[in-house]
């Protein structure tokens, strides 16, 4: 049948299950003149053959675990043996069957864990191998804890990552493990292939003995340090200790202070490096971190608290150079004139900041001295003697001594005698009518001018008018500023108006004096005015609940997986339609109604993470206003990139004849993320036929050395196939080729005929 089992020479891939006895031909290649025969080369392993007439077949059952892919080449030759077509690559993929059971690398594992270790952080890995294909269920292993001994209150203290075999503490284990109670535990772990999902899976078990050790990585007690210390600095104030020697300690100032007066040495001792000032900062919270030699944190940071103890190093200070109070002529004895409030920067509610007030001088002393008294601790001035007469003495000056337990300060008070407040403010209008404003009127705008008058003594607290909104504005959207010269009130917008919550407001103003009214006089209707505020609707765009929405998924999620969602609301209550903008890779779609975001194509961390798109929320109906937010999709890595050579290795050569076995170094890489430990590639010669001549040895996780096994090479080019495995989960493998030339060498390296001059040799013999 042309096409499936026969056809012209072209690159092809065939899949054959391992273990199957050969039962039929693989393919019949058809020759095009002048081709008359075919030739097969590559990784035949003496299993794959081609008849001269183009019949490709195999002679015995394949074993995927021996070779998972056979890279063959087929060429068409003419009647003189010259290649006239090809060679073309023919790939035989050996498909896996579950013919291998998983096996733990050890029958017994031992490990230790510190109490209070972070839950979920592996402290020990068990590792099983299964020779079957890790890209199929046959080689996908699933780990499970079968038994935990002892088991207290049926609570599991340990958990295992079913994919990686990493054993860690559960939340309960982190909180409750105590070496004083139970210093050791035993786990029985099972591993199953078929991802643990099949009755037909193979399994193995292993035993894990775990010792619980004490955790001394604990936050110390809070430290108290007296300010302005005159002792030599630095002064040790506390210490932290990692569980093992060799940790590198550092302090982290989360507050980003301009001056951070603490340090830590490599023993874990913490010092204050200079005198502290409680009035600058009364407490410090910072963190002690322990890291390994690679700078990687060994555990969570410890919070260090330092409280700065106060000393009395600050004198009282007056509120202003002169404090002015007013007193009406007819004030009664004992009435409060005002309160002098001095300040002391020392710690509040302690003896260091407790202030005493005392009047040390009154001028003039008319009609007598001692007209005023001050409450010793409160600072309230009261009238101590008869009522005052403005025509006799319109102004008094007091000198008041304010003291704490160590310092004294003099403050000055001016008392003005004013007429009695027997007139109330009277509005010029009781109703300021209606006012209509759009809800987007600017904050700070003056929307109305109001005016009241007061017949009391001008420019005193008896005639000064303060306006208050006492009704109709519970949200505090309006305010009134008073002109001190004219008592005109300017009504301003303090907070944005909102049609949706307050379309009509019936506003009531009250006009008052800062001075109390005389006995028998009260504010009446003349001191009140009203107006009605109508707010008109302005269609507003929808509002997102966040400016940036962020989600995290694995790069290998299935197409159609929900990867995140966004929400917006329309102030007018209209429905919202969501859309995406800037989805340059065509990875995502959004549900127009719910805002849920789904993948519609394979994601790829290596193409860029986070993947940033814009989300647009548009009103349905109305003015179709829209607003934009950001959606950032963080892609976590899976091992989906096979290893490759880190660069093109051109012009590798050895001088012929070899005097001794030679070697050269090459580097592998891949595009996956290698957090913490970096790549861990393994290397092997890909073809049995090459193994007598070449060997490859690993230098580190990325570099390997290709060496000759002998010196008996012809003067020609050799193509050496090398298999590189990245050891990932699942492990990916690829076969790369290094072309090595054995050639006559001159002073400038490898001699080749004109037209192919190599570069400077990259290989030293």
């Amino acid at each position: 049948q042309e096409g499936k089992f026969s056809g012209p020479l072209k690159p092809m891939t065939f899949s054959i299950y391992e273990g199957q006895e050969p039962s039929q031909i693989i393919f019949q290649f058809k020759a095009n003149p002048p081709a008359v025969t075919f030739e097969l080369t590559g990784e035949t392993d003496n299993i794959f053959k081609i008849e001269r007439e183009g019949l490709l077949y195999y002679t015995k059952a394949l074993d995927r675990e021996t070779r998972s892919t056979h890279n063959l080449q087929v060429a068409a030759l003419d009647a003189n043996g010259a290649i006239v077509e090809g060679p073309v690559p023919i790939t035989i993929e050996v498909k896996d069957v579950n013919d291998n059971r998983p096996t733990f690398l050890q029958s017994k594992y031992e490990g230790s864990v510190r109490q209070n270790s972070r839950p979920g952080k592996p402290f020990l890995y068990v590792n099983a191998t299964d020779l079957d294909d890790p890209a199929t269920p046959n080689g996908q292993l699933s780990y499970q804890i079968v038994i935990q001994l002892p088991m207290i209150n049926n609570v599991m203290y340990f958990q295992i990552n079913n994919k990686t075999g990493g054993i860690s503490l559960t939340r309960e284990g982190s909180q409750e493990l105590n070496p004083a109670k139970n210093p050791s535990y035993n786990l029985v772990i099972s591993v199953k292939d078929m991802g643990g999902q099949s009755e037909n899976s193979f399994s193995d078990t292993t035993s894990v003995d775990i010792i619980v050790t004490e955790n001394i990585w604990k936050a110390p007690e809070p430290v108290e340090m007296v300010e302005n210390s005159t002792d030599p600095h630095p002064i040790k104030i506390t210490q932290v200790r990692w569980n093992d020697p060799g940790a590198q300690y550092s302090l982290v100032d989360k507050e980003k202070l301009p001056r951070f007066p603490f340090s830590i040495d490599q023993e874990g001792d913490i010092y204050v490096t200079q005198p502290l000032d409680r009035e600058e900062k009364d407490a410090y919270v910072f963190y002690a971190v322990a890291k390994d030699e690679y700078g990687k944190p060994l555990s969570y940071p410890l919070e260090i608290h330092v409280k700065v103890q106060d000393i009395n190093d600050n004198p009282p200070t007056c509120p202003s150079p002169v404090t002015v109070f007013e007193v009406q002529e007819n004030e009664r004895l004992g009435n409060s004139i005002g309160t002098l409030t001095a300040h002391d920067s020392d710690e509040e509610n302690t003896a260091n900041s407790l202030l005493n007030y005392r009047i040390v001088e009154q001028t003039p002393k008319l009609p007598m001295d001692g007209l005023f008294l001050i409450q010793t601790y409160a600072g309230m001035l009261q009238l101590a003697k008869q009522s005052l007469k403005k025509q006799d003495t319109p102004q008094y000056n007091l000198t008041i001594e304010v003291s704490d337990k160590d310092f004294k300060t003099l403050c000055f008070v001016q008392i003005n005698v004013i007429d009695i407040n027997d007139q109330i403010p009277i509005f010029e209008k009781s109703d300021y009518g209606n006012l209509t404003l759009a809800e987007d009127t600017n904050v700070g705008s003056t929307i109305l001018t109001i005016q009241a008058t007061d017949a009391d003594e001008p420019f005193t607290g008896s005639s000064k008018i303060l306006y208050h909104v006492i009704k109709g504005d519970s949200e505090g959207r309006l305010g009134v500023d008073t002109d001190p010269h004219t008592n005109t009130g300017y009504v301003i917008i303090k907070k944005p108006l909102d049609f949706e919550t307050a379309a009509i407001s019936n506003i009531v103003f009250k006009a008052e004096n800062p001075e109390p009214l005389v006995f028998g006089v009260t504010y009446n209707a003349s001191s009140f005015a009203k107006f009605t505020l109508f707010v008109t609707d302005v269609n507003e765009a929808p509002e997102f609940s966040q400016y940036v929405f962020q989600a995290k998924v694995s790069e290998d999620v299935a197409i159609g997986t929900k990867v995140g969602n966004v929400t917006a609301k329309d102030p007018e209550g209209l429905d919202i339609s969501y859309s995406l903008r800037g989805d340059t890779r065509g990875w995502l779609k959004i549900d127009h109604v719910t805002g849920e975001i789904f993948s519609v194509a394979p994601l790829d961390r290596e193409a860029g993470s986070p993947y940033r798109v814009q989300v647009v929320a548009t009103e349905v109906g109305g003015s179709s206003l829209s607003s934009v937010s950001q959606f950032h999709l963080i892609l976590t890595d899976v091992n989906d990139n096979p290893p490759r050579l880190a660069k093109d290795y051109m012009d590798l050569y050895f001088c012929h004849p070899l005097s001794a076995p030679g070697s050269l170094i090459f580097e592998a890489t891949d595009d996956d993320q290698h957090l913490f430990r970096g790549p861990h590639f393994t290397f092997s010669i890909a073809s049995e036929s090459l193994q007598n001549d070449w060997q490859v040895s690993k230098i580190n996780g990325t570099h390997a050395r290709l060496s000759t096994r002998h010196t008996d090479f012809e003067e020609k080019e050799y193509v050496v196939s090398i298999r590189i495995n990245d050891g990932g989960r699942p492990p990916l493998e690829s076969t790369v080729s290094l072309t090595v030339t054995f050639c006559s060498c001159g002073e400038d390296g490898c001699f080749r005929p004109a037209g192919h001059q190599p570069g400077i040799p990259t290989v030293g013999m």
């Epitope: 003149p33 002048p34 008359v36 025969t37 001269r52 003419d78 009647a79 003189n80 043996g81 010259a82 012809e714 020609k716 080019e717 005929p753 037209g755």
Partner: antibody, heavy 122, light 108 residues
Amino acid sequence: QVQLVQSGAEVKKPGSSVKISCKVSGYTFTDHTIHWMRQAPGQGLEWIGYIFPRDDIVVYAQKFQGRATLTADKSTSTAYMELSSLRSEDTAVYYCARPPYYYSRNFYFDYWGQGTTLTVSS
Amino acid sequence: DIQMTQSPSSLSASVGDRVTITCRVSSIISSSKLHWYQQKPGKAPKPLIYGTSTLASGVPSRFSGSGSGTDYTLTISSLQPEDFATYYCQQWSNYPFTFGQGTKLEIK
């Protein structure tokens, strides 16, 4: 035993054509290609082309494309080389030769004809 | 086309001498595709060595060949009277098949 017997010497005028034959015996004619070479007096050998009688596949050297014609008569196990538009520089000894069986892995001219002398002269 | 350059073009030697003829190819070829032929005056060439180093049927063992890449040699370890002839190298790697210009071996 294998033999390749060529036709006799030819004298031709410039502009004319010549057809030289090569009759083979001692092997299966269709299993081998037949190649034609020539050797000008005192010069080296020059390859003209080949024919594979089994499939009537013919390949020419670029230099002789359009002027040389290779044919084969399977019934008489004879190969022919016709050269047209003759000029004096075509004066040479013309050889037919064959390599081993086309399934072989070693290809070289293991049997040769005795040569046919062509003289082109006005 | 691949060029074949033989050296020397001619060579005088005596019976019993060791003689080496070289053939340089203008581009690298597989050693299995380089052959040597011997031609005597008035006769067709006859195969001497194929695949660089394999003696053709009936060729005495005093003839040998070696080389790889672009440089190949024909060696006669001890010249015999019947060895005086013209020798050609030929490549079977690319069409058109090409021959060296020949090396004429004469009696000194």
